[in-house]
Amino acid sequence: ESALITQQDLAPQQRAAPQQKRSSPSEGLCPPGHHISEDGRDCISCKYGQDYSTHWNDLLFCLRCTRCDSGEVELSPCTTTRNTVCQCEEGTFREEDSPEMCRKCRTGCPRGMVKVGDCTPWSDIECVHKESGTKHSGEVPAVEETVTSSPGTPASPCSLSG
């Protein structure tokens, strides 16, 4: 009657291997680092470096770890309870509205503007008009001043879910 996933539906590395640790669910849920069996009777541990779960859950399989793309550095590895944390390499950044790729930071501000913010893994350099102090939209300028910036030091990681 129940249309639940079968072990055959899972990728080979997601199949419950006999050596995986099992425990009983609590209130029908399994702890972080585990997923539930199809019949709801067992909690099965995720595989370190392969998959994970972050909360108490009744997932039928753990979530696949993110692999950092080229152009990204791995800040912390995937564990059974936390996904990989990836960050753009120095000199590149990831915007919220285009999270799929790291973009090169601009090397300087357009004429008539001054740099007030460095390139970080999550933002381009920030430019403001010399007189008014208003921010530049972030479009790549047609003409750049010779003022260049060195990539900023990351202040905190930019986590990606897989």
Partner: nanobody
Framework: EVQLVESGGGSVQAGDSLRLSCAAS????????VGWFRQTPGKEREFVAA????????YYADSVKGRFTISRDNAKNTVYMQMASLKPEDTAVYYC???????????????????WGQGTQVTVSS
């Protein structure tokens, strides 16, 4: 890949009923419990109801208890939410969710979910 597809939203008058459906377009919901959340502009998603697809156990937010009924049809891989005695404050985008996430095992209200549908708008006018 788990994909959830909602349907059944629409515009109704206060006191009317609607039935929302959530179908797993893959072969699985990816979890035993499936739930509904709702969201109004500028507010966080709010848990509405959930059901255990194995044994039919149900969970409801206090705000909808006695008015909304969640059910499942495992053969059709679909979860339903019958919404009765609708109020203007029920106006929201309703999301089907699976892989419900809880901070503690004893919690009745999930803090989020792994898998989400695209949402269906429900508008209740007075």
């Amino acid at each position: 890949e788990v994909q959830l597809v909602e349907s059944g939203g629409g515009s109704v008058q206060a006191g009317d009923s609607l039935r929302l459906s959530c179908a797993a377009s893959g072969r699985t919901f990816g979890s035993i419990r499936v739930g509904w959340f709702r969201q109004t502009p500028g507010k966080e998603r709010e848990f509405v109801a959930a059901i255990n697809r194995n044994d039919g156990t149900t969970y409801y937010a206090d705000s909808v208890k006695g008015r909304f009924t969640i059910s499942r049809d495992n053969a059709k891989n679909t979860v339903y939410m019958q919404m009765a005695s609708l109020k203007p404050e029920d106006t929201a985008v309703y999301y089907c969710a699976a892989g419900l996430q809880y901070n503690r095992s004893a919690d009745r209200v999930p803090v989020g979910a792994v898998y989400w549908g695209q949402g269906t708008q429900v508008t209740v006018s007075s």
